[in-house]
């Protein structure tokens, strides 16, 4: 059982969150495309979290393919320290509240929130399920608490921590899992599998995050939720690695699997897209 | 006070296009999501397509999708609807909302008659 | 998509007197942020439409407090507490809920 081969590492609290993305087409695997010509391109790595060269072919491929390392790393990366802990007392919005409201390209049309830059506020919006950008919040609340300026002089991030503004402290936020865990993974780990609505039977993975195990179920096919993986490996992968157990005292202990070597293969269900 | 005034209707033979405007004013249009909607004469309403703030999203009826494209240039306060592969079913009176932060349609157009006859 | 359905489709009053419109949705209205989001516009002779209430119950600026909306889950009802000749044209039930928004066929409100 691959959920043996896991290694317990202390961590400490700077450690990147999960990779969230501004661009989806950022997670995509870098496509050479099926032509033959050898032209030097960038792309962004989501394992390695940088843009990286590789050989385009010339056609076709993908939106994961820049002409010079500086527009992917303008595309696909931001300022971590800037992006993650706000250390001004201005604590500027994250940069992806400024983003449109963005759909996406599937239609399973349910209601989202997004920060309207031009009214300065949380809005409704109909998110079609998949992609998409991270100005995408499950709440009003939620959308508030991270792209509105807050009454009381904090802002809050979108890692689950808020910005204390008189001494810039992070102060973890309460979590809907078990007391001794915070989840840090993809939101969609937290959700219970949805066969969808269509007819197949097709066998996939979901995380169960009671038992915090990767488990079997049925797949209609369509529809359905983000946590729906096609194989065990890639469930841990997804999910596992998101929950941090809490010492007591104050240290991490992080359960995070080992790096084996890694098949770059993005599904819909490894891009982290904020809240999809 | 908000207005939205459409134009561009007119008499279409089937399979011909047209391309509607609303001018929209009392407002700040860049702030609100925008929709077309129809009525058929005698008929009910219909939703036809509605743009997000900005203009790069879009979401369409089934029964226009592929023949309609929803547009806007929020420098010049308009919204656009440009109908191509037109139909006798698309004879209408079109109008354009706006949309709410609730994502509702609030203020509506006076509406221009769209006919699709040979 | 969500079917609208209205009744009744004419409805004849008389000046002064209460009118009531029904409208149910073929599923639940309730979305899952909570809100219900039901909506009711007038259409005047001759005029474009003109939002009344939204959200089930709440009365856009302007609108008269004669009319008042109410309802949950599938059943939703639009009454007009005293019927006034203004109050003439065809009034439309439409849902924001589930995506795409759909209308009901539209109740035609005369003074007999």
């Known amino acids: 059982d691959s959920e043996e081969d896991e290694e317990h590492t202390i961590i400490t609290d700077t450690e990147l969150p999960p990779l969230k993305l501004m661009h989806s087409f950022c997670a995509f695997k870098a496509d050479d495309g099926p032509c033959k010509a050898i032209m030097k391109r960038f792309f962004f790595n989501i394992f390695t979290r940088q843009c990286e060269e590789f050989i385009y072919g010339g056609c076709e491929g993908n939106q994961n393919r820049f002409e010079s390392l500086e527009e992917c790393k303008k595309m696909c990366t931001r300022d971590n320290a800037n992006r993650i802990i706000k250390t001004t007392l201005q604590q500027e919005k994250p940069d992806f509240c400024f983003l449109e409201e963005d759909p996406g390209i599937c239609r399973g049309y349910i209601t989202r929130y997004f920060y309207n830059n031009q009214t300065k506020q949380c809005e409704r919006f109909k998110y079609g399920g998949c992609l998409g950008n991270m100005n995408n919040f499950e709440t009003l609340e939620e959308c508030k608490n991270i792209c509105e300026d807050g009454p009381n002089g904090f802002q809050v991030d979108n890692y689950g921590t808020q910005l204390n503004a008189v001494n810039n402290s992070l102060t973890p936020q309460s979590t809907k899992v078990p007391s001794l865990f915070e989840f840090h993974g993809p939101s969609w780990c937290l959700t219970p599998a949805d066969r969808g609505l269509c007819r197949a039977n097709e066998n996939r993975f979901y995380y169960n995050s009671v038992i915090g195990k990767c488990r079997p179920f049925k797949y209609s096919g369509c529809g359905g939720n983000e946590n729906n993986f096609t194989s065990k490996q890639e469930c841990l992968r997804a999910c596992k690695k998101g929950f941090i157990q809490r010492i007591s005292k104050g240290g991490l202990i992080k359960t995070k699997r080992k790096r084996k070597k890694q098949r770059v293969k993005i599904a819909y269900e490894e891009i982290f897209v904020k809240n999809m | 006070e908000v207005q939205l005034v459409e134009s561009g209707g007119g008499l279409v033979k089937p399979g011909g296009s047209l391309r509607l405007s609303c001018a929209a004013s009392?407002?700040?249009?860049?702030?609100?999501?925008m929709n077309w909607v129809r009525q058929a004469p005698g008929k009910g309403l219909e939703w036809v397509s509605t743009?997000?703030?900005?203009?790069?999203?879009?979401y369409y009826a089934d029964s226009v999708d592929g023949r309609f494209t929803i547009s806007r240039d929020n420098a010049k306060n308009s919204l656009y609807l440009q109908m191509n592969s037109l139909r006798a079913e698309d004879t209408a009176v079109y109008y354009c909302?706006?949309?709410?932060?609730?994502?509702?349609?609030?203020?509506w157009g006076q509406g221009t008659l769209v006919t699709v006859s040979s | 998509d969500v079917v609208m359905t209205q009744t009744p489709l004419s409805l004849p009053v008389t000046l002064g007197q209460p009118a009531s419109i029904s409208c149910k949705s073929s599923?639940?209205?309730?979305?899952?942020?909570?809100?219900?989001?039901l909506n009711w516009l007038q259409q005047r002779p001759g005029q474009s439409p003109k939002r009344l209430i939204y959200?089930?119950?709440k009365l856009d600026s302007g609108v008269p407090d004669r009319f008042t909306g109410s309802g949950s889950g599938t059943d939703f009802t639009l009454k007009i507490s005293r019927v006034e000749a203004e109050d003439v044209g065809v009034y439309y039930c439409?849902?924001?809920?589930?995506?795409?928004?759909?209308f009901g066929q539209g109740t035609k409100v005369e003074i007999k």
């Open positions: 599923q639940s209205l309730l979305d899952i942020d909570g809100k219900t989001y």
């Open positions: 743009i997000t703030t900005g203009g790069s999203y879009t």
């Open positions: 009392g407002f700040t249009f860049s702030s609100y999501a």
């Open positions: 909302a706006r949309q709410d932060g609730h994502f509702l349609m609030d203020y």
């Open positions: 439409w849902q924001g809920t589930h995506f795409p928004f759909t």
């Open positions: 959200l089930v119950s």
